[in-house]
Amino acid sequence: IGLLYPFPRDCSQAMLNGDTTSGLYTIYINGDKTQALEVYCDMTSDGGGWIVFLRRKNGREDFYRNWKAYAAGFGDRREEFWLGLDNLSKITAQGQYELRVDLQDHGESAYAVYDRFSVGDAKSRYKLKVEGYSGTAGDSMNYHNGRSFSTYDKDTDSAITNCALSYKGAFWYKNCHRVNLMGRYGDNNHSQGVNWFHWKGHEYSIQFAEMKLRPSNFRNLEGRRKRA
């Protein structure tokens, strides 16, 4: 029996192929076998099928990086990493995606889900669209909706200062942030650390954070697979 999706375009299609263990998988942008991309799939959180595109867990990876690094991606997909803005832009251009953010700290956990998530192309400076919040972490991403991505060497924020420079990270900064998941790991100084404002505020750096995405219609696809 052939696979449902011989060239899965995301982790949800990998899951629908029968792969239910979290780990590294190859996906294919637009189902094109020449556009292979290795990703980490979270197959357990809220039904699974998530492409993880950011993980913070121990501070071993340097996230204070330039525009080129954030465009391309960096790090070890099994450990701390950033998948890359170019990849995110291509993936979210495939259809309607949702965003999930998982946060953990000293036994506590919280999450945020956004029904509609996309990252624009390089021309838009990877403009963020994030709408339709639900969850327990608080709607901190709302503030960043519509913003372009900023790094210390490409300042696209609306602040007088360079937000990425001031807070030693990179993000879809406005003036400056309510979310700083690419901030300095373990730094509890105001606004410098791994922050999700409406959960732990700006004076506490969160121990574990993941950002992930999957098709917004995943529930329907999953139901179809089960019926089949």
Partner: antibody, heavy 120, light 107 residues
Framework: QVQLVESGGGLVQPGRSLRLSCAAS????????MHWVRQAPGKGLEWVSG????????YYADSVKGRFTISRDNAKNSLYLQMNSLRAEDTALYYC?????????????WGQGTMVTVSS | DIQMTQSPASLPTPVGDRVTITCRAS??????LNWYQQKPGKAPKLLIY???NLETGVPSRFSGSGSGTDFTLTISSLQPEDFATYYC?????????FGQGTKVDIK
């Protein structure tokens, strides 16, 4: 053009209730958080309450928590403030205001205000 | 709650002069600071958002600066239509709070 028009103010006795309305036009109403801000006669501005674009999140000043309820009807492009157990110190001009972008943000559009007087 | 302290409370100024109003937050608020102008009998009008961004349609003689806890609104050359009360507001956290206002009147 973008416009906010408040209504529902008036003279009310202490302990009674009043419901303010704000009719919005000229923008996609459900895309924006909305707020109520008040100004007592001869005094400064005081934020009262806010609500997210979907209506899923609501916020209140401590001075009105448990007495006032903010709500919205996106189908009618309308914002409301239900004010119960009114006190003399609630006497003010009540403004409806649109959030610039996110829930906690600058207020870029304001209505003309509706006066609430609480007196026996 | 975050307290916002404006100074001065009153500022008599001749037309054409430079005006500087300061606003101090009781805690660090990044750049989450907005400025409004209010004329008697009128609703407030947004002038500056996010500390330094001029709202559309606001004359370029208005400017904002500052970050963290200390912020400034500057009118480079006061015009007759600028006589009004000016308020700062923090949008860093709920409840959003306003300064007590600075009344700029004719000297």
């Amino acid at each position: 053009q973008v416009q906010l028009v408040e209504s529902g103010g008036g003279l009310v006795q202490p302990g009674r209730s009043l419901r303010l309305s704000c009719a919005a036009s000229g923008f996609t109403f459900d895309d924006y958080a909305m707020h109520w801000v008040r100004q007592a006669p001869g005094k400064g501005l005081e934020w009262v309450s806010g609500i997210s674009g979907s209506g899923g999140s609501t916020y209140y000043a401590d001075s009105v928590k448990g007495r006032f309820t903010i709500s919205r009807d996106n189908a009618k492009n309308s914002l409301y403030l239900q004010m119960n157990s009114l006190r003399a110190e609630d006497t003010a001009l009540y403004y409806c205001a649109k959030s610039y972008q996110s829930d906690e943000d600058a207020f870029d559009i304001w209505g003309q205000g509706t006066m609430v007087t609480v007196s026996s | 709650d975050i307290q916002m302290t404006q100074s001065p409370a009153s500022l008599p100024t001749p037309v054409g002069d430079r005006v500087t109003i300061t606003c101090r937050a009781s805690q660090y608020i990044q750049g989450f600071l907005n400025w409004y102008q209010q004329k008697p009998g009128k609703a407030p009008k947004l002038l500056i958002y996010d500390a330094s961004n001029l709202e559309t349609g606001v004359p370029s003689r208005f400017s904002g600066s500052g970050s963290g806890t200390d912020f400034t609104l500057t009118i480079s050359s006061l015009q007759p239509e600028d006589f009004a009360t000016y308020y700062c507001q923090q949008s860093y956290s709920t409840p959003q709070t306003f300064g007590q206002g600075t009344k700029v009147d004719i000297k």
